[in-house]
């Protein structure tokens, strides 16, 4: 039943042209190589993605021409070596051009950047970007891809085209319009924000195939569909999990031609086979590919089957739960998997994976006890806590940011994040409390059987970048610690982290608090990250400061931008109320 | 009223196959494990298998390979396949309702009435 | 395979008589105590009488009683009534749900 059987290919890069079609193949290969090597400028990946493109033409022509037959990882990895300032741009990663397939590869996936030193992405004026588009638009989306391509090592490429076509809808229909702006820039801003959210969603699963193998990444996948499809079989729901599996591992190993025809495959195969996987998937399946793909991976739950039996039944009260168990045991544990999910959309995918955990830690023990229904009659008790300290987590945390609201809740989640894991550079800690705090606006709304979910998966997402940033420059043992040992409970593990008493302050440094009347000109966001980051610095000089004392500076500080803002001569202003809030807030916080 | 219905006996050819259904009534196949028992004319009862509420399933060892019991829970029924039948096979089939829900205690407190199957060239 | 064996394999009584009948498993029973007895009258289906060799079925009267652990099982039918006279059937439940077995029956007739 798998759908990925395929006969062998002569020439697979001549396969994935005609699978593909020229569009995609050439938006595929530039997303590839922009992945890869994101310093080079956009010129020269255009030229090498024009040269790949004429190259497999040619394979497609005729499939035995010279070199048709090679791999697609040594056709592109051969082209990459071809660049000329390889080891000026790179430093070492040209080394992974002396290593042969598939370590080439390997080596090149290992230098990918999730943090590359790229200027921010500055947004041209509405005319300027629609001239742009008129004037040679293929060219302009091309750019697009690219863009984001270099910035988003991960991201998911089949879901890049889709972004892509959206991209260029916005700009058809609002470069047309009467006011440009309205139109556009709405549009604008809803693509950053849902591909920022698509990007850290993909760099999760492309973590936990990488860091913790394709059996994580499966389980993950089984509770997620089993909560999405709760009326699909769990053979169903195996195939898909497997084929979702090769799709991802494809993506997340720079093998974005082979993903997207797969996903394309997968998609196709889902909407043949929607009356025995969910009956939401109607209007997902009249749509066009890339749309219909995006809409199944979004869709909403299905209902739950009425009159599902009791799972102590089959998994605790059976005297067979050993014998199951010992014959197959990722199956059986798959299974117990699958029917806690689809009774429980109501959990967060993580809290279901600690409960499977927790349940063959527990057979594990008992399958070699003396009497081991005895052992494990009470598995299910053992539950109980790990749903409730999520549940009140939650509850909270929500609490807490009806109160404060969302500037507010980020900014107790800076301190909060701060004081735990001090050593963290302050733009990743502004950064990940920052998207932390945004937990509340998306979650809190919820009612209570949506708002595990949203918020457990959605922190698991924010702190995978914490992870992954923080692997790069390694600075606390806490932080590695709690990224490494366990995917599923990264969340607990954070969130049971104390003040780090062994912190020695940061010295302080009168610079870091001065500010200037640019800010003035700062849109609010970008106002509020300058405050942030003042606040961490704060912590860092003062990490036993109390709420209350944090709490005055920063309102000192706001009414000291508002004050200067308003001033006639704004930089002055800075210059001399800057010292007096220095000192004042030297002797508030007693440093 | 609470009863199960067997139903697709009949006369079949040796090597042939046949699935045998068990419709429930008046309550919902979904709390108890299913079971399927066998009796030959004028002979004893042999257990064949029986399939859990979550779908496990397990067999005699006679039976392994050849019968399959499976359900369906939208429908309240239970099925048996039968392949590569033998004369011995002849036998009237009976489905069953297990007091326990994931497993086989071999206490039955529901019984169909029963589905003569002959095996026969 | 596990093996059940009943005896006596058929007996004769009387209205009023107490009559015992029993079974033996190969194997210890699963918790020592699975084992039931069924009642069967031509042309009709099994009844169950006794689980978890002492538990009394729904609707079954108290002149049924069933005892024994582990591998020796009685079923006692304290004073015989006419509609008593059929075959019963012991069966047990194992460490596996694979090999649950009935014995091959004790065949009660009027003396």
């Known amino acids: 039943r798998g759908v990925f059987r395929r006969d062998a290919h002569k020439s697979e890069v001549a396969h994935r042209f005609k699978d593909l079609g020229e569009e995609n193949f050439k938006a595929l290969v530039l997303i590839a190589f922009a992945q890869y090597l994101q310093q080079c400028p956009f010129e020269d990946h255009v030229k090498l993605v024009n040269e790949v493109t004429e190259f497999a033409k040619t394979c497609v022509a005729d499939e035995s021409a010279e070199n048709c037959d090679k791999s697609l990882h040594t056709l592109f990895g051969d082209k990459l070596c071809t660049v000329a300032t390889l080891r000026e741009t790179y430093g070492e990663m040209a080394d992974c051009c002396a290593k042969q397939e598939p370590e080439r590869n390997e080596c090149f996936l290992q230098h990918k950047d999730d943090n590359p030193n790229l200027p921010r992405l500055v947004r041209p004026e509405v005319d300027v970007m629609c001239t742009a588009f008129h004037d040679n638009e293929e060219t302009f989306l091309k750019k697009y891809l690219y863009e984001i391509a270099r910035r988003h090592p991960y991201f998911y490429a089949p879901e890049l085209l889709f972004f892509a076509k959206r991209y260029k809808a916005a700009f058809t229909e609002c470069c047309q319009a009467a006011d440009k702006a309205a139109c556009l820039l709405p549009k604008l801003d809803e693509l950053r924000d849902e591909g920022k959210a698509s990007s850290a969603k993909q760099r999760l699963k492309c973590a936990s195939l990488q860091k913790f193998g394709e059996r994580a990444f499966k389980a993950w996948a089984v509770a997620r569909l089993s909560q999405r499809f709760p009326k699909a079989e769990f053979a169903e729901v195996s195939k898909l999990v497997t084929d979702l599996t090769k799709v991802h591992t494809e993506c997340c190993h720079g093998d974005l031609l082979e993903c997207a025809d797969d996903r394309a495959d997968l998609a196709k195969y889902i909407c043949e086979n929607q009356d025995s996987i969910s009956s939401k998937l109607k209007e997902c399946c009249e749509k066009p590919l890339l749309e219909k793909s995006h809409c199944i991976a979004e869709v909403e739950n299905d209902e739950m089957p009425a009159d599902l039996p009791s799972l102590a039944a089959d998994f605790v009260e059976s005297k067979d739960v050993c014998k199951n168990y010992a014959e197959a045991k990722d199956v059986f544990l798959g299974m117990f998997l699958y029917e806690y999910a689809r009774r429980h959309p109501d959990y967060s995918v993580v809290l279901l994976l600690r409960l499977a955990k927790t349940y063959e830690t527990t057979l594990e023990k008992c399958c070699a006890a003396a009497d081991p229904h005895e052992c494990y009659a009470k598995v299910f008790d053992e539950f109980k806590p790990l749903v409730e300290e999520p549940q009140n987590l939650i509850k909270q945390n929500c609490e807490l940011f009806e109160q404060l609201g969302e500037y507010k809740f980020q900014n107790a989640l800076l301190v909060r994040y701060t004081k735990k894991v001090p050593q963290v550079s302050t733009p990743t800690l502004v950064e990940v409390s920052r998207n932390l705090g945004k937990v509340g606006s998306k979650c809190c709304k919820h009612p209570e059987a949506k708002r595990m979910p949203c918020a457990e998966d959605y922190l698991s997402v924010v702190l995978n970048q914490l992870c992954v940033l923080h692997e790069k420059t390694p600075v606390s043992d806490r932080v590695t610690k709690c990224c490494t040992e366990s995917l599923v409970n990264r969340r607990p593990c954070f969130s049971a982290l104390e003040v780090d008493e062994t912190y020695v302050p940061k010295e302080f440094n009168a610079e870091t608090f001065t500010f200037h009347a640019d800010i003035c000109t700062l849109s609010e966001k970008e106002r509020q990250i300058k405050k942030q980051t003042a606040l961490v610095e704060l912590v860092k000089h003062k990490p036993k400061a109390t709420k209350e004392q944090l709490k005055a500076v920063m309102d000192d500080f706001a009414a000291f931008v508002e004050k200067c803002c308003k001033a006639d001569d704004k930089e002055t202003c800075f210059a001399e109320e800057g010292k007096k809030l220095v000192a004042a807030s030297q002797a508030a916080l007693g440093l | 009223e609470v009863q199960l219905v067997e139903s697709g006996g009949g006369l079949v050819q040796p090597g042939g196959s046949l699935r045998l259904s068990c419709a429930a009534s008046?309550?919902?196949?979904?709390?108890?494990?299913m079971g399927w028992v066998r009796q030959a004319p004028g002979k004893c009862l042999e257990y064949i298998g029986i399939?859990?509420?979550?779908?496990?399933?397990y067999y005699a060892s006679w039976a392994k390979g050849r019968f399959t019991i499976s359900r369906d829970n939208s429908k309240n029924t239970v099925y048996l396949q039968m392949n590569s039948l033998r004369a011995e096979d002849t036998a009237t089939y009976f489905c069953?309702?297990?007091?326990?829900?994931?497993?086989?205690?071999?206490?039955?407190?529901?019984w169909g009435q029963g589905t003569l199957v002959t095996v026969s060239s | 395979d596990i093996q059940m064996t009943q005896s006596p394999s058929s007996l004769s009584a009387s209205v009023g008589d107490r009559v015992t009948i029993t079974c033996q498993s190969s194997?210890?029973?699963?918790?020592?105590?699975?084992l039931s007895w069924y009642q069967q009258k031509p042309g009709q289906p099994p009844k169950l009488l006794i689980y978890?060799?002492?538990d009394l079925a729904s609707g079954v009267p108290s002149r049924f009683s069933g005892s024994g652990s582990g591998t020796d099982f009685t079923l006692t039918i304290s004073s015989l009534q006419p509609e008593d006279f059929a075959t019963y059937y012991c069966?047990?439940?194992?460490?596996?749900?694979?090999?649950?077995?009935f014995g091959c029956g004790t065949k009660l007739t009027v003396l």
């Open positions: 069953a309702r297990d007091r326990h829900g994931g497993d086989s205690s071999g206490a039955f407190y529901l």
């Open positions: 008046g309550f919902s196949l979904s709390s108890n494990a």
């Open positions: 194997e210890s029973v699963y918790s020592n105590n699975q």
């Open positions: 978890d060799a002492s």
């Open positions: 399939i859990s509420v979550g779908g496990f399933t």
């Open positions: 069966a047990g439940g194992f460490s596996s749900s694979s090999d649950t077995a």
